[in-house]
């Protein structure tokens, strides 16, 4: 029977900067029960605090709610294990909510075979942004990301969106059915999952074109880029 | 509705012991940490103990440290105060508050009254 | 500990003025700092958290500043219900401290 070896903070995470989660690695029990506490303080902050909810974000966390996150400080934290034997605790990990930002996936994607008369079929689609994060405040700039693949094909292809949350793609095999799929990221901080994929069959007779594909702007009615293969790469985030 | 309502105040004796609790409801107390604060007319606001939400972070001012032990109890939503080797300068009123790191919301009781006196 | 100084002690003015009431703390507290009313026979009643933060419910008329050392409520146009006590607190370190306490009375 031995103390328990040193535990370790692996993850922090925040849907939208409001609220956020961390999650510990236990180490070695030594062989008896082991009580784990989170402690923490702010800077410029000398006064510790304990983790005030150690359920939300189940086994191993600590979650901080609304009235324990603060944009504007980083949290210095340690996890302590203690059994029987003796305590061990972990590195100290600082924590700035600002960039550790995962948002929920994007909602409501929406996806359509358009066949303008004048022009060349393609595929569009359009997303929201997810419900938790609010753009108006001007705290985020959410960046999006595209991904489809025929429903049978191993390899997906991926296009960057920018900030736009509408999106058009040419270059589609006929008569395939396609996955896709949209996720998104602030301007700091991480990927979100991808959304639930959506189903599209392309038309036998969508036309193809290899050479190049149509990317709009924010503004569908606005100016459209034909952009070709080449500058495309420079879009890709595979 | 939040309610903090203190009890265990009381006329004793110096050298004295007392026991406070503070009962709690309309809020998740078991994520708040817990304070006692006292309030004598010469010292004016006192903050004297302070419990984080599992216990594992204990404060107590100068002035009680070695006298008075500060404990809760989640399951039952109470927060105590243990006052052993009672002075005549602890005559105040005791206050118990719920606070986050930023003090928002914070919740107080309405205190209660302890004599030391012979 | 850190000591917390309050000046004025005791502010008169009418209702409609304003109010600037002042503290300053012994060494720096950052801006984990707080203002607090209190009226006779009440708990204290949290103004302001974070130095300038209003906490919930209270009028915008009560504003905070300051960072450091030296710390200023200010309300701007004084109601009837606003002559009380007021205190200011640090929450940087322990011992958790308060000023001695502004009494803001009636003229």
């Known amino acids: 029977q031995l103390p328990p070896g040193k535990p370790e903070i692996f993850k922090c995470r925040s849907p939208n900067k409001e609220t956020f989660t961390c999650w510990w690695r236990p180490g070695t029990d030594g062989g008896l029960p082991t009580n784990y506490s989170l402690t923490y303080h702010r800077e410029g902050e000398t006064l510790m605090h304990e983790c005030p909810d150690y359920i939300t974000g189940g086994p191993n966390s600590c979650h901080f709610g609304k009235q324990y996150t603060s944009m504007w400080r980083t949290y210095v934290m340690m996890v302590n294990a203690t059994n029987q034997m003796g305590s061990s605790f972990s590195d100290e990990l600082y924590v700035d909510v600002t960039y550790i930002v995962q948002p929920d996936p994007p909602l409501e994607l929406t996806v359509e075979v358009k066949q303008p008369e004048d022009r060349k079929p393609y595929l569009w689609m359009k997303w929201s942004p997810p419900t938790l994060i609010d753009l108006k405040t001007g705290w985020f700039t959410l960046l999006y990301e595209i991904r489809l693949k025929p429903e049978k094909a191993a390899e997906w292809e991926t296009h960057f969106a920018g900030q736009q949350t509408e999106f058009k793609i040419l270059s589609l095999h006929p008569g395939q059915k396609y996955l896709v799929q949209v996720r998104c990221k602030p301007d700091h901080g991480y990927w979100s999952a991808w959304s639930p994929a959506t189903f599209i069959q392309i038309p036998s007779d969508f036309i193809m074109n290899d050479e190049q594909k149509l990317i709009s702007e924010e503004d569908l009615g606005g100016e459209q880029k034909l952009i070709s293969e080449e500058d495309l790469h420079h879009h890709h985030h595979h | 509705e939040v309610h903090l309502v203190e009890s265990g105040g009381g006329l004793v004796q110096p050298g004295g012991s007392l026991r406070l609790s503070c009962a709690a409801s309309?809020?998740?107390?078991?994520?708040?940490?817990m304070n006692w604060v006292r309030q004598t007319p010469g010292k004016g606001l006192e903050w004297i103990s302070h419990?984080?939400?599992?216990?594992?972070?204990?404060y107590y001012a100068d002035s009680v440290k070695g006298r008075f032990t500060i404990s809760r109890d989640n399951a039952k939503n109470s927060l105590f105060l243990q006052m052993n080797s009672l002075r005549a300068e602890d005559t105040a009123v005791y206050f118990c508050?719920?606070?986050?790191?930023?003090?928002?919301?914070?919740?107080w009781g309405q205190g209660t009254l302890v004599t030391v006196s012979s | 500990e850190i000591v917390l100084t309050q000046s004025p002690a005791t502010l008169s003015l009418s209702p409609g003025e304003r109010a600037t009431l002042s503290c300053r703390a012994s060494?720096?507290?950052?801006?984990?700092f707080a203002w607090y009313q209190q009226k006779p026979g009440q708990a204290p009643r949290l103004l302001i958290y974070?130095?300038?933060s209003r906490a919930t419910g209270i009028p915008t008329r009560f504003s905070g500043s300051g960072s450091g050392t030296d710390f200023t409520l200010t309300i701007s146009s004084l109601e009837p219900e606003d002559f009380a006590v007021y205190y200011c607190?640090?929450?940087?370190?322990?011992?958790?401290?308060f000023g001695q306490g502004t009494r803001l009375e009636i003229k």
């Open positions: 060494q720096s507290v950052s801006s984990y």
């Open positions: 508050a719920g606070i986050t790191i930023f003090g928002i919301p914070e919740y």
């Open positions: 974070d130095a300038s």
């Open positions: 607190q640090q929450r940087s370190s322990w011992p958790i401290t």
């Open positions: 309309g809020f998740t107390f078991s994520s708040y940490e």
């Open positions: 419990i984080s939400s599992r216990s594992v972070i204990i």
